[in-house]
Interface confidence: low
């Protein structure tokens, strides 16, 4: 899915209002320095691509994030404010259902959510797309997004 045409400000507002709090709740009891951020993104569409991947694609050691409150709210925000997003998620949803029998918070899941927090912070302050570039502008971003 190409996230270029999403309403970024509304997604940002959804993040600030509830998603961010749900991520903090999930990470409660974990030190903020416990995990190193290894995933990054260069602009808003790219950040959403990475956020979607980490939130909804089961990974080795962490197959259960899709049922968490932050994930459901992320999906709702993308479905409302990214035209045509819902239609692309049908097969992915079926695959997730097979993988998420139980909700177990593993260390790997905590690490993954820590990465998500970093991606969301980057999404909300998408400056310095590349070295020497000027501050982020929505229109400018359409020419720099990554297709996945």
């Amino acid at each position: 899915y190409d996230f270029t045409n999403c309403d970024f400000e509304k997604i940002k507002a959804a993040y600030l209002s509830t998603i961010s709090k749900d991520l903090i709740t999930y990470m409660s009891g974990t030190k903020s320095t416990e995990f190193n951020n290894t995933v990054s993104c260069s602009n808003r569409p790219h950040c959403l691509t990475e956020i979607q991947s980490l939130t909804f694609n089961p990974t080795a050691g962490c197959a259960s994030l899709a049922k968490e409150m932050f994930a459901m709210k992320t999906k709702a925000a993308l479905a409302i404010w990214c035209p045509g997003y819902s239609e692309t998620q049908i097969n992915a949803t079926q695959a997730m259902k097979k993988a998420r029998k139980s909700k177990v918070t593993t260390n790997k899941c905590l690490e993954q959510v820590s990465q998500l927090q970093g991606l969301w912070r980057r999404f909300n302050r998408p400056l310095l797309k590349q070295q020497g570039s000027s501050d982020y502008k929505d229109d400018d971003d359409k020419h720099h997004h990554h297709h996945h």
Epitope: K10, S17, A79, E87, Q89
Partner: antibody, heavy 121, light 105 residues
């Protein structure tokens, strides 16, 4: 207990506008989305659109885009649906329905009692 | 938009009988919700996400299906079950089926 209480029945003339309200209580209004659904006499349920009470973000059924306007008053925990340029086929019961996150697919788990709008000359 | 077609339009059965209601989508959807509506009342959630019973709904109701074909089953009809049933999808905006009326034979 979650409750959605809608405004009373309206009778309007063709070409006029109507604004239906939906007062929410029993939950944090800004945490969930609100849908509006139309049901003409003897007809299926028809989705009009959805709004995020947190910031007023909306998405509409193309059929109603341009004629339906969804708004909220956060301080009053109230959602509104305004329908303009009314015609006879707009005669229907209009429902507000909260969309919850607790289930796959964010289903409409609580509904208002419905507001009957009659369009007649 | 995804069109949902429910069949049959009317189902005439007696209390105690089994009711099987079908909902077919014009293209694949990831899950289906079901609602019950009685005359003069708002719809009431029955089944969330294909097979999850909504709060307070008796176990005689069940849902199944995937892709384009979904089913609502009432194992033994009780007098209060005679009503109109709607399916609803979320994969592309939100659309409802035309409804199946379950009436007393």
């Amino acid at each position: 207990e979650v409750q959605l209480v809608q405004s009373g029945a309206e009778v309007k003339k063709p070409g006029a506008s109507v604004k239906v309200s939906c007062k929410a209580s029993g939950y944090t209004f800004t945490d969930d989305y609100m849908n509006w659904v139309k049901q003409a006499p003897g007809q299926r349920l028809e989705w009009i659109g959805i709004i995020s009470p947190y910031n007023g973000g909306t998405s509409y059924n193309q059929k109603f885009k341009g004629r339906a306007t969804l708004t909220v008053d956060k301080s009053a925990s109230t959602a509104y649906m305004e329908l303009s340029s009314l015609r006879s086929e707009d005669t229907a019961v209009y429902y507000c329905a909260r969309e919850d996150y607790d289930y796959d697919g964010y289903a409409m788990d609580h509904w208002g009692q419905g507001t009957t709008v009659t369009v007649s000359s | 938009e995804i069109v949902l077609t429910q069949s049959p339009a009317t189902l005439s059965l007696s209390p105690g009988e089994r009711a099987t209601l079908s909902c077919r989508a014009s293209s694949s959807v990831s899950y289906m919700h079901w609602y019950q509506q009685k005359p003069g009342q708002a719809p009431r959630p029955l089944i969330y996400a294909t097979s999850n019973l909504a709060s307070g709904i008796p176990a005689r109701f069940s849902g199944s299906g995937s892709g384009t074909d979904y089913t609502l089953t009432i194992s033994r009809l009780e007098p209060e079950d005679f009503a109109v049933y709607y399916c609803q999808q979320w994969s592309s905006n939100r659309t409802f089926g035309g409804g199946t009326k379950v009436e007393i034979k």
